[in-house]
Interface confidence: low
């Protein structure tokens, strides 16, 4: 189903106000009718243009260029271009045979202002619009592009053509018709209004500038469909492929006809199967086939002639190379020519655009860019060269700071940093607690060479990974005075660690006396237990990095604090020592800010308040 936004987009696409109503009437209109687009005959034909499970629809673009002009590689569609409406939405049915795909309604019409050139080049592109949930709207991709050069007189009958592009086959008809008052094979003569005095006989119309030359209008059978029928003789109505009925108004697909060929059956109104002279397109070298009352007629592209366009007379003088291809060959009619195609094009006439990036010329994950005249590879970090083939030694001349070692991998330079450092070159202090290494609610404390976990009650180990009593017995010792055993804000350090902390407290106190006192609560610092002389005991700095807890005293109202917010108040704990365990409790009285390095905003961890030599740090 097409979303309202999508249908709105389409309606806007159908009426682009920049492209507006004609100011002057065109001399004529080139009309293209697509009959079918689908998998061609033979093995390897695609089943469907749609990606699996994604609905899609087709539309077509035609580009016309004068056939006798030398075309530059990037020349515009000098005769004009047109875009069809979108076709019906098609969804591939798994296991179903590949069908002819639903096509857009109507003709593609390209108006031309000046004389119809008689010989022209065309490019017809088949586009797929995928209607999945792509970001940025539907995805468009080119399915097939066919090109050719044809002779065509304006006012003539519809010419039929079959073109193959890869595994796809496109069947279409085209014609050029003049817009009144223009007439003639090039739409260059102007007819006088019917009210003008006429020397022509009944049913004939006078034309200027040659007053004595009159043309008999070709009048098809009354009611003959102008879109699906045509006539070569007055009074007849011949149907385009896919249409039937006396006035070509009945689509073949809606009847029970087996074949769009042969005479009408009087009983069913259907076409009785019969071979058509244009079946299989007997015209060689891109010639287009038109059925005649007795047989068929080939309209040959420039440079080919004969009943089936089998005789080649193309020379470089005819300009057979598209898209700026260089023609090599003699000028006499018997010598062959060769087109040397510019980059990005191939085919005997350089008519096919090549996706050169599909050959994946860029190595080591490089991004391929087809610039038309050249290919470029945008290399990933660590690679260089026209095709990203050179693996750079990214470690050469690169030092990793703070004891880090340079590692090469996949062409990218990276540093394996020492504990406590991070970043591309190990120049940034890393928070070893960021990964939340302490299990079972244990608290992580950063140390200059690693981290220490303070375990929650009932757990022990370097990362608090072991229950103290696996059988479930309580491991809580008696709480020190003033602290309740059930208080969730208390954390238990392993007894050995508690003794080590106790041993280092005196040194820590001496160290911290020299920390300059700041009273601003925004730059939150250490917290002291209420009533404790300052600064008798200092908290483990930057301690509470990885925990959601309740701030405030155990009794009063509390508010939630997220310790992971980077620019928030950074409360710290005060530890009351009570061998053999240490309990911690937060008290909301900030006194000391964290120490800072010279670089703004980058905090440096205080040294742990006991000697690292006696700690077992993982």
């Amino acid at each position: 189903m097409v979303s309202p936004r999508m249908s709105g987009l389409l309606s806007q696409t159908v009426i682009l106000a920049l492209i507006f109503l004609p100011q002057t009437r065109p001399a004529g209109v080139f009309e293209l009718q697509i009959h079918s687009f689908g998998p061609g005959p033979g093995p390897g034909a695609p089943r469907s243009p749609c990606s699996a499970r994604l609905p899609c629809r087709l539309f077509f673009r035609v580009c016309l260029k004068p056939g006798l002009s030398e075309e530059a590689a990037e020349s515009p569609c000098a005769l004009g271009a047109a875009l069809s409406a979108r076709g019906p939405v098609y969804t591939e049915q798994p296991g179903a045979p590949a069908p002819d795909l639903p096509l857009p309604d109507g003709l593609l019409q390209v108006p031309f202002r000046d004389a119809w050139p008689g010989t022209f080049s065309f490019i017809i592109e088949t586009w797929r619009e995928e209607l999945g949930d792509q970001i940025g709207g539907p995805a468009w991709s080119l399915l097939a592009r066919v090109a050719g050069r044809r002779r065509l007189a304006a006012g003539g009958p519809w010419a039929r053509d079959i073109q193959r592009a890869g595994a796809w086959e496109l069947r279409f008809s085209y014609r050029a018709r003049c817009e009144p008052p223009a007439v003639g094979t090039a739409c260059t003569r102007l007819c006088r209004p019917r009210s003008a005095p006429s020397r022509c006989g009944p049913g004939l119309r006078p034309c200027a500038p040659l007053e004595d030359e009159c043309e008999a209008p070709l009048v098809c059978r009354a009611g003959c469909s102008p879109e699906h029928g045509f006539c070569e003789q007055p009074g007849e109505c011949r149907c385009l492929e896919g249409w039937t009925g006396p006035l070509c108004t009945v689509p073949v697909s809606t009847s029970s006809c087996l074949s769009p060929r042969g005479p009408s059956s009087a009983t069913t109104g259907c076409l009785v199967p019969g071979p058509g002279p244009c079946d299989g397109n007997p015209c060689a070298n891109g010639g287009s086939c038109s059925e005649t009352p007795r047989s068929f007629e080939c309209t040959c592209p420039r440079g080919f002639y004969g009943l089936r366009c089998e005789v080649s007379g193309v020379t470089c003088a005819d300009g057979p190379c598209f898209n700026g291809g260089l023609c090599v060959g003699g000028a006499d009619p018997d010598s062959a020519y060769i087109c040397h195609c510019p980059p990005g094009f191939q085919g005997s006439n350089c008519e096919k655009r090549v996706d050169r990036c599909s050959l994946q010329p860029c190595r080591n994950g490089g991004l391929c860019l087809d610039l038309g005249h050249a290919l470029r590879c945008r290399c990933r970090a660590g690679f260089a060269g026209p095709r990203c083939e050179h693996d750079l030694d990214d470690c050469a001349g690169r030092a990793c700071a703070n004891g880090g070692t340079c590692v090469e991998g996949g062409g990218a330079h990276r540093c394996s940093c020492a504990l406590g450092f991070g970043g591309r070159d190990c120049r940034e202090r890393a928070d070893p607690c960021a990964a939340r290494p302490c299990a079972h609610g244990g608290r992580c404390y950063a140390h200059f060479s690693g981290l220490v976990c303070a375990c929650a009650p009932g757990y022990m180990g370097a990362r608090c990974e072991f229950p103290v009593h696996p059988d479930g017995a309580s491991a809580l010792p008696a709480a020190p005075p003033g602290l309740r055993p059930g208080d969730p804000q208390r954390y238990l350090l392993p007894p050995a660690l508690g003794l080590l902390v106790a041993a280092g407290v005196a040194g820590a106190a001496l160290l911290l006396v020299h920390v300059r006192r700041r009273g601003h609560s925004q730059d939150a610092g250490s917290r002291l237990l209420a009533g404790t002389p300052e600064p008798s005991v200092h908290a483990l700095p930057d301690a509470l990095n990885n925990l959601r807890t309740q701030e405030g005293s155990g009794d009063g109202p509390s508010s939630s604090v997220d310790w992971n917010r980077p620019e928030d108040v950074d409360p710290q704990g005060i530890y009351v020592i009570s061998a053999p365990s240490i309990y911690a409790r937060e008290v909301a009285t900030p006194l000391f800010p964290p120490l800072h390095t010279g670089r703004a905003g980058q905090r440096q961890h205080l040294l742990f308040p006991y000697p690292s030599s006696i700690l077992s740090v993982k």
């Epitope: 987009l9 920049l18 492209i19 065109p26 875009l83 069809s84 108006p111 709207g137 468009w140």
Partner: nanobody, 129 residues
Framework: QVRLVESGGGSVQAGGSLRLSCVAS?????????MGWFRQAPGKEREGVAA???????SYADSVKGRFTISKDNAKNTLYLQMNSLKPEDTAMYYC??????????????????????WGQGTQVTVSS
């Protein structure tokens, strides 16, 4: 056919501004997905500058993002390119283009460079330092 006529080019000092206009005349029976601007400096490859689609969605080359603005006035059948903070490297012939965008409006810049359906004769922009 469609005729595209550019105007508004000229000489300006670095840091100055110019507004290019492109008037479209002619007729289509069918529509086009984008219109846009591209430029070509002497001895350099043509490059897409800015494109706008039928929904008014726009895309810009990296080199002009934040400095150039593409817009259209449907009533006047005119496409505009407002160029601010001009640099000497913006010196080039600027062309208006109309055509069918390949894939989407972002890639229309590349499609415009490769094979626009219609383009104008160009207007010269010279930025001196």
């Amino acid at each position: 056919q469609v005729r595209l006529v550019e105007s508004g080019g000229g000489s300006v000092q670095a840091g100055g501004s110019l507004r290019l206009s492109c008037v479209a005349s002619g007729y289509f029976y069918n529509t086009y997905y984008f219109m846009g601007w591209f430029r070509q400096a002497p001895g350099k490859e043509r490059e897409g500058v800015a494109a706008i689609d039928t929904d008014g969605r726009t895309s810009y080359a990296d080199s002009v993002k934040g400095r150039f603005t593409i817009s259209k006035d449907n009533a006047k059948n005119t496409l505009y390119l407002q160029m601010n903070s001009l640099k000497p490297e913006d010196t080039a012939m600027y062309y208006c283009a109309a055509g069918f965008g390949y894939m989407n409006v972002i890639q229309a810049l590349n499609g415009m460079r490769q094979n626009p359906d219609y383009w104008g004769q160009g207007t010269q922009v010279t930025v001196s330092s």
